[in-house]
Amino acid sequence: EVEKTACPSGKKAREIDESLIFYKKWELEACVDAALLATQMDRVNAIPFTYEQLDVLKHKLDELYPQGYPESVIQHLGYLFLKMSPEDIRKWNVTSLETLKALLEVNKGHEMSPQVATLIDRFVKGRGQLDKDTLDTLTAFYPGYLCSLSPEELSSVPPSSIWAVRPQDLDTCDPRQLDVLYPKARLAFQNMNGSEYFVKIQSFLGGAPTEDLKALSQQNVSMDLATFMKLRTDAVLPLTVAEVQKLLGPHVEGLKAEERHRPVRDWILRQRQDDLDTLGLGLQGGIPNGYLVLDLSMQEALS
């Protein structure tokens, strides 16, 4: 905290300009009027104040707006945003996408900080849902943003917003998140033709149920192994050898390299060995010929 000292004669700031970078912290505190600062916030970002000087300017704004800054000030915070704590940001009411973009720009190139996470949370909650424009903006700055949300939060994403999602935005999503996103993607892309549809839906298939995978196997999609390995194990297990062969097309040969990894390993254990042998890949571990397979889960459902 800067000591309260009288402003030296002739140093009272009449406007926010470059001359202030030569002020010591105590001079900024004593000579810059908080109301003047608030009305000329748009100038602050263009002036190369040190981070220590920015601390003083923040302190002045905090005193002027103890309940939280108005959006007219927030929009022009610029580098001063880096000085805000999550507690500061929780007091704000940010409604404009332009304000959000301006603040994300300041943090560009850095990982998502607690401040940015709080800002986004406040913004999205204020809007009530994660609309397409917001999602476009957030994933442009933070490709991993979508996967940082809980399944509950993802449920507020309207299907129309899915068009903004790029494959890399889903890289770090876990199966529970894809379970929520997949039906939205299916709805969003439903009017596309086969090959175009597959290109768009491919990144979301980690949330696809068995029946959708069976349907895809009838469409000559040639799914790559990387996508196949991300499918839900419970969705893959009921697929027949013929269905997997159709689903993967020429990529089926890659199963051999993955035979010890899920979901391939568990799928192999569920197939008849003679069916696996038809692939000619040397996959081992299937059910030997002559064995009867009882599906106990089906039996329990019937009783």
Epitope: I21, P48, F49, T50, Y51, E52, Q53, L54, Y79
Partner: nanobody, 115 residues
Framework: EVQLVESGGGSVQVGETLRLSCTAS????????MGWYRQAPGDECELVST???????NYADSVKGRFTISQDNAKNTVYLQMTSLKPEDTAIYSC?????????WGQGTLVTVSS
């Protein structure tokens, strides 16, 4: 990686002259606004002088008329010519790109002015 190496400091008597140098690497020097900061023992960081990429200069009131900032783009070097030195000029002097917003930090070069 941005690197700034200051030199030229030393001990002098009141009224004497020193020239500080700051050699830069790791960024486009001639596009950058540069500044000299100083910090006296027990005092806070203070900006002494700036020079913008177009060559315009500014000074703190306390050094106006005594200090001159200049740069040599060919050598990636910014200078601070200090004349009529006073005891209150005693400090560690550091140069910075103004965009870094860091101020007094790092090694710097020590200037001691004794009466």
């Amino acid at each position: 990686e941005v690197q700034l190496v200051e030199s030229g400091g030393g001990s002098v008597q009141v009224g004497e002259t020193l020239r500080l140098s700051c050699t830069a690497s790791g960024f486009t020097f001639d596009d950058s606004d540069m500044g000299w900061y100083r910090q006296a023992p027990g005092d806070e960081c203070e900006l002494v002088s700036t020079i913008s990429s177009d060559g315009s200069t500014n000074y703190a009131d306390s050094v106006k008329g005594r200090f001159t900032i200049s740069q040599d783009n060919a050598k990636n070097t910014v200078y601070l010519q200090m004349t009529s030195l006073k005891p209150e000029d005693t400090a560690i002097y550091s140069c910075r790109t103004m965009a870094s917003r860091i101020g007094c930090w790092g090694q710097g070069t020590l200037v001691t002015v004794s009466s």
